[in-house]
Interface confidence: low
């Protein structure tokens, strides 16, 4: 019998390299059985995760899984950082692994840098 616990399928240490000025959708894959859980996004700030209250979000429903999406329209330099989604379900709080956005300012790079370049050229990152 399939478990009816809510599950959030963000992979551990997942990352996205994106350009400032582009639109971007950050997906939180959510699996649930009956009632849709209350899902929110937060951004990590040190040891706390600050809830993103006034950001546009949406649901994308697919056959076997749903995606709770955080919209960046457009991506801003200060969107750089780590994010986590969490679900409230039957009084339980389920938290995802964090996912990190590496934002490159288009004025600083003529082309999208690789992850290795990001690591070796931290000045490209806005923190």
């Amino acid at each position: 019998k399939e478990s009816c616990d809510v599950q959030l399928y963000i992979k551990r240490q997942s990352e996205h390299s994106i350009l400032a000025g582009d639109p971007f959708e950050l997906e939180c894959p959510v699996k649930y059985c009956a009632n849709r859980p209350h899902v929110t996004w937060c951004k990590l700030n040190g040891t706390t995760c600050v809830k993103l209250e006034d950001r546009q979000t949406s649901w994308k429903e697919e056959k076997n899984i749903s995606f709770f999406i955080l919209h960046f329209e457009p991506v801003l330099p200060n969107d750089n950082g780590s994010y986590r989604c969490s679900a409230n379900f039957q009084s339980n709080l389920i938290e995802s692994h964090s996912t990190t956005l590496y934002v490159t300012d288009v004025k600083s790079a003529s082309e999208r840098p690789s992850k290795d370049e990001m690591a070796s050229r931290p000045w490209l990152l806005y923190r």
Partner: antibody, heavy 120, light 108 residues
Framework: QVQLQESGPGLVKPSETLSLTCTVS????????WSWIRQPPGKGLEWIGY???????NYNPSLKSRITISVDTSKNQFSLKLSSVTAADTAVYYC??????????????WGQGTLVTVSS | EIVMTQSPATLSLSPGERATLSCRAS???????LSWYQQKPGQAPRLLIY???TRATGIPARFSGSGSGTDFTLTISSLQPEDFAVYYC?????????FGGGTKVEIK
């Protein structure tokens, strides 16, 4: 200011297909969910279904077997097709935009509605 | 499907009076998944409240929403002539999205 305008025939014969289009002006159809809602004369509101600008859909199970909602981002339009109509499908049909908040949604912009009568 | 039940069906009040409209869900919809709409004859519904208590853009402060779980309330603190209309609640906790049957606020 976002505006929505429904268009389509006001009279459909029983067993035929009802086809309506909603044209969005004053804003892009992209990055939003769009919905159809209907209201039989003198009665309450019934949600029909929604479509995301990417084409992802979800329909009311009570109508699912008869509904198709599609989107044409190039024309800033989305459409409803309801097949095998009966007199019970006579209603004012509204298109609406979804406002997304936290993990829920409401309808913030509505068309003025179009009355569709099913009669032979 | 979550069934939304509104009461009373009709509320007869005078301008200046306080209106209290009730909406009950057949199962818990949390506090964040309830909206209220106003509809006048021949017009489309207008969003008043979402997330149970957040006023939509341009909605006067005399409209307020409260409640959680299965019981929600829309309060109009002092009825204005333009407030006489039908009011609907709507849940979006679970699909399909469902509306209540409406409460008509009429002039006494």
């Amino acid at each position: 200011q976002v505006q929505l305008q429904e268009s389509g025939p006001g009279l459909v014969k029983p067993s035929e297909t009802l086809s309506l289009t909603c044209t969005v002006s004053g804003g892009s159809i992209s990055s939003y969910y769009w919905s159809w809602i209907r209201q039989p004369p003198g009665k309450g509101l019934e949600w029909i279904g929604y479509i995301y600008y990417s084409g992802s859909t979800n329909y009311n199970p009570s109508l699912k077997s008869r509904i198709t909602i599609s989107v044409d981002t190039s024309k800033n339009q989305f459409s409803l097709k309801l097949s095998s109509v009966t007199a019970a499908d006579t209603a004012v049909y509204y298109c609406a935009r979804v406002i997304l908040y936290s993990s829920g949604w409401s309808f913030d912009y509505w068309g003025q509605g179009t009355l569709v009568t099913v009669s032979s | 499907e979550i069934v939304m039940t509104q009461s009373p069906a009709t509320l007869s009040l005078s301008p200046g009076e306080r209106a209290t409209l009730s909406c009950r869900a057949s199962q818990s919809v949390s506090s964040s998944y309830l909206s209220w709409y106003q509809q006048k004859p021949g017009q489309a519904p207008r969003l008043l409240i979402y997330g149970a208590s957040t006023r939509a853009t341009g909605i006067p402060a005399r409209f307020s929403g409260s409640g959680s779980g299965t019981d929600f309330t829309l309060t109009i603190s002092s009825l204005q002539p333009e407030d006489f209309a039908v009011y609907y609640c709507q849940q979006d906790y679970n699909l399909p999205l469902t509306f209540g049957g409406g409460t008509k606020v009429e002039i006494k």
